[in-house]
Interface confidence: low
């Protein structure tokens, strides 16, 4: 039978919530990332913006979690089609907004 | 602790068939794509074949393609590798490797290798 | 079919650097893997997405990726370090391994 394609998504659903929860300090030194449009390819595009992030453990595992849902090599300073144009949030925002998002495509089933 | 067992290998005649078979503990063993490769006798790695972690899909080498068919039970935790019409280069030691968390199997590296288990083919 | 090419055999004096190449077109388009086999064992991942190393490979293993070629580092090489080496990289739905280095420690 198929392997439920939830298990990949619950477990980056919560490594993205214990990010939020143990948050004390900025998160990654307050770094900035790329903003996405998160309608589609969320996972090649997430993992572009936050590949540009470097030195910060907190994110080390969601990185190489989404590295798992995108199919091609990315590479820092990659350009995404799907990057919001000139719009750059905190690492924290982001974070926060993939979570959301994410958590709406479990909801609805939409795993990949 | 992650283990995988394989078992199944033997000594068959050209033509014959087998099935190894791989146990494996200490995982979510549904979450991960897993692989098979062998190694001939003082030869190098060959990927034979795999089986997604995120779907059904299955990747065949061309060298075993249309004569090998990997299949997984995630209620038993195992992996199978059924292989038929065999012959004397399919002789190596069969390795049944966890291939990472993720949709995309090929991009977590073969992070656990079983012990392996041989299969020799000859009459 | 797509090709690896590595050099059969490398040697390096204890404390020096072993350098292991791995060719194949536009490999650096793809992830590279880099594996370590002791004789009589199974293979060990050193090296994944060209440069990363897993937990509990020691910082003398790096790796690096671009244009045609994917390179192994040993540096401050040791006698443990002796060992069969392959590349790894993923094309159209299949995985394709280096032809292996051996890597002697003199």
């Known amino acids: 039978s198929p392997v439920p394609p939830s298990t990949a998504l619950k477990e980056l659903i919560e490594e993205l919530v214990n990010i939020t929860q143990n948050q004390k300090a900025p998160l990654c030194n307050g770094s900035m990332v790329w903003s996405i449009n998160l309608t589609a390819g969320v996972y090649c595009a997430a993992l572009e913006s936050l590949i540009n992030v470097s030195g910060c453990s907190a994110i080390e595992k969601t990185q190489r979690m989404l590295n798992g849902f995108c199919p091609h090599k990315v590479s820092a300073g990659q350009f995404s089609s799907l990057r919001v144009r000139d719009t750059k949030i905190e690492v924290a925002q982001f974070v926060k907004d993939l979570l959301v998002h994410l958590k709406k495509l479990f909801r609805e089933g939409q795993f990949n | 602790e992650v283990q995988l067992l394989e078992s199944g290998g033997g000594l068959v005649q050209p033509g014959g068939s087998l099935r190894l078979s791989c146990a494996a503990s200490g995982f979510t063993f549904s979450s991960y794509a897993m692989s098979w490769v062998r190694q001939a006798p003082g030869k190098g790695l060959e990927w034979v074949s795999a089986f997604s972690g995120w779907d059904v899909s299955t990747y065949y080498a061309d060298s075993v393609k249309g004569r090998f068919t990997i299949s997984r039970d995630n209620s038993k935790n195992t992996l199978y590798l059924q292989m038929n019409s065999l012959r004397a280069e399919d002789t190596a030691v069969y390795y049944c490797?966890?291939?990472?968390?993720?949709?995309?199997?090929?991009?977590?590296?073969?992070?656990?290798w079983g012990q392996g288990t041989t299969v020799t083919v000859s009459s | 079919s797509y090709e690896l090419t590595q050099p059969p055999s490398v040697s390096v004096s204890p404390g020096q650097t072993a350098s292991i190449t791995c060719s194949g077109d536009?490999?650096?388009?793809?992830?590279s893997f880099w594996f370590q086999q002791k004789p009589g064992q199974s293979p060990v991942l050193v090296i994944y997405?060209?440069?990363k190393r897993p937990s509990g490979i020691p910082e003398r293993f790096s790796g690096s990726n671009s244009g045609d070629t994917a390179t192994l580092t040993i540096s401050g090489t040791q006698a443990m370090d002796e060992a069969d080496y392959y590349c790894q990289a993923w094309d159209s739905s299949t995985y394709v391994f280096g032809t292996g280095t051996k890597v002697t420690v003199l």
């Open positions: 536009k490999l650096g388009d793809k992830y």
């Open positions: 490797v966890q291939d990472g968390l993720g949709p995309y199997f090929y991009n977590y590296g073969m992070d656990v």
């Open positions: 997405h060209d440069s």
